[in-house]
C-alpha cells in the first residue's frame, strides 16, 4: 500500500517517499522505485538553507554600497550573505535592506545608548547638574564643573547646554 506520510527529511511524490536534498544542494530529479533522489550543489553565489526539494538555489543577498551596506558575513552554499551598515549608519529594518545615518544628540541632550549597525542613537535630556554643548552621536551629558573643589566660586550657573563658569573667591557678590 502506498504511503500517505513520510519520515523527516523525506517528501511524498508519485506515492513514494523520496529523500529531500540537504542544505546547500538543489533537486535535479525525484527518486524512483529504482533510483535515489538526485541533488546538485548550489553555484558560487547561491544557497539553500534547509532540507529541500527546490529546483533552483536562492541568490545570495547583495550588499549594495550605494545604500550604505557592506558584507558582515559572507554567504555559503547553506547560508545567505548577512549585510550590515557602514560605520556611522544603521539598518532601516530587520532585514537590513538599506541604511540611514546615525542620529546625533543635540546640545542639551546626551547619548544614552550609542547606535549599532541595527539600532539608532538613543538620546536623553541632560538633567540639572549636567550639560552637553555639542551635537554628537557619542557624547554623554557631562557633569558641571565643581568650582568648590578648585577653591573657586560659581560666577555663572550652568545650564543643560553650558558648564558653570568658575571664578576667584574675591569676585563673590
Amino acid at each position: 500500500e502506498p504511503p500517505t506520510a513520510c519520515r523527516e527529511k523525506q517528501y511524498l511524490i508519485n506515492s513514494q517517499c523520496c529523500s529531500l536534498c540537504q542544505p546547500g544542494q538543489k533537486l535535479v530529479s525525484d527518486c524512483t522505485e529504482f533510483t535515489e533522489t538526485e541533488c546538485l550543489p548550489c553555484g558560487e553565489s547561491e544557497f539553500l538553507d534547509t532540507w529541500n526539494r527546490e529546483t533552483h538555489c536562492h541568490q545570495h543577498k547583495y550588499c549594495d554600497p550605494n545604500l550604505g551596506l557592506r558584507v558582515q558575513q559572507k554567504g555559503t552554499s547553506e547560508t545567505d550573505t548577512i549585510c550590515t551598515c557602514e560605520e556611522g549608519w544603521h539598518c532601516t529594518s530587520e532585514a537590513c535592506e538599506s541604511c540611514v545615518l546615525h542620529r546625533s544628540c543635540s546640545p542639551g541632550f546626551g547619548v544614552k545608548q550609542i547606535a549599532t549597525g541595527v539600532s539608532d542613537t538613543i538620546c536623553e535630556p541632560c538633567p540639572v547638574g549636567f550639560f552637553s554643548n555639542v551635537s554628537s552621536a557619542f557624547e554623554k551629558c557631562h557633569p558641571w564643573t565643581s568650582c568648590e573643589t578648585k577653591d573657586l566660586v560659581v560666577q555663572q550657573a550652568g545650564t543643560n547646554k553650558t558648564d558653570v563658569v568658575c571664578g576667584p573667591q574675591d569676585r563673590l557678590r
Epitope: G110, K112, Q113, E124, P125, C126, P127, V128, G129, F130, K140, C141, P143, W144, S146, C147, E148, V153, V154, Q155, Q156, A157, N160, L172, R173
Partner: antibody, heavy 122, light 113 residues
Framework: QVQLVQSGAEVKKPGSSVKVSCKAS????????IEWIRQAPGQGLEWMGS????????NYNQKFQGRVTITADTSTSTAYMELSSLRSEDTAVYYC???????????????WGQGTLVTVSS | DIQMTQSPSSVSASVGDRVTITCRSS????????????LAWYQQKPGKAPKLLIY???TRESGVPDRFSGSGSGTDFTLTISSLQPEDFATYYC?????????FGQGTKVEIK
C-alpha cells in the same frame, strides 16, 4: 541649624507689586540655591523661580512672563521675590526654600520658610 | 515642561492602614549616567510649609520615620505609608527636579475614614 524666615503678610491692590523677603541662617547662603514656590488657597504647589545668591544666576518659570524678579543680598543673607502687575489670582502663600548647596546633587527642597500670605484685592 | 500626575487625589484611611500614592511623570526622570531618578516627595499639613520626606525617588530624608518609603523608576513612582499614624493625615506632593521648570503633582490628601 538651617532657618529661613520670611517677611509678614501683605495686602495689595491689583496692578501693584509685592516684594517678599527670605532671611537665611545656619548655612553658606552664597553657594546654595534659594527657590520660590507659591500655593493659592486650596491649591497645589507651583515653582516660580530660583537664585544662586553668590553669582546672581537665576532661573524663572516662564509662566510668569517677566512678572517675577528674584534677587539676593549676600551681605544680609536675604533673598527677595518681587511679583509685579498683581491680579486676584496671585493671592497665595509664597514660600522660599533651600535648593542645591553647590554639590549639584541636592536639587530637592530640604528646608522651607514659614510662608508669606499675599492677598490681592481691590 | 514635565507634567506630574498624582493619583488618587484623596484617600480615606484608618490608623494602621497601608496607604499607597502614585505619581506619574510625562517623561522619564531616570538619568542613565548616574542611574538616579530625579523625584522627591513632600508632606504638607494645613497652614504649614511642606516637609521633605523622600528624594532620589527612594532615599528617606533624615528624621523621617521608616514607615514612609518611596519606590519606582522612569515615569512611575509610589509613596507608601506602611502603617498610617494619626500625624500622617496630610497632603502629599511629588515633585521632579530633572530640568527647569520644576513641577509638582497636584497633591493627594490622606483623610481620616
Amino acid at each position: 541649624q538651617v532657618q529661613l524666615v520670611q517677611s509678614g503678610a501683605e495686602v495689595k491692590k491689583p496692578g501693584s507689586s509685592v516684594k517678599v523677603s527670605c532671611k537665611a541662617s545656619g548655612y553658606t547662603f552664597s553657594t546654595s540655591w534659594i527657590e520660590w514656590i507659591r500655593q493659592a488657597p486650596g491649591q497645589g504647589l507651583e515653582w516660580m523661580g530660583s537664585i544662586l545668591p553668590g553669582s546672581g544666576s537665576t532661573n524663572y518659570n516662564q509662566k510668569f512672563q517677566g512678572r517675577v524678579t528674584i534677587t539676593a543680598d549676600t551681605s544680609t543673607s536675604t533673598a527677595y521675590m518681587e511679583l509685579s502687575s498683581l491680579r486676584s489670582e496671585d493671592t497665595a502663600v509664597y514660600y522660599c526654600a533651600r535648593g542645591d548647596d553647590g554639590s549639584y546633587v541636592r536639587w530637592y527642597f530640604d528646608h522651607w520658610g514659614q510662608g508669606t500670605l499675599v492677598t490681592v484685592s481691590s | 515642561d514635565i507634567q506630574m500626575t498624582q493619583s488618587p487625589s484623596s484617600v480615606s484611611a484608618s490608623v494602621g492602614d497601608r496607604v499607597t500614592i502614585t505619581c506619574r511623570s510625562s517623561q522619564s526622570l531616570l538619568f542613565s549616567v548616574n542611574q538616579k531618578n530625579y523625584l522627591a516627595w513632600y508632606q504638607q499639613k494645613p497652614g504649614k510649609a511642606p516637609k521633605l520626606l523622600i528624594y532620589w525617588a527612594s532615599t528617606r530624608e533624615s528624621g523621617v520615620p521608616d514607615r514612609f518609603s518611596g519606590s519606582g523608576s522612569g515615569t512611575d513612582f509610589t509613596l507608601t505609608i506602611s502603617s498610617l499614624q494619626p500625624e500622617d493625615f496630610a497632603t502629599y506632593y511629588c515633585q521632579h527636579y530633572y530640568s527647569y521648570p520644576w513641577t509638582f503633582g497636584q497633591g493627594t490628601k490622606v483623610e481620616i475614614k
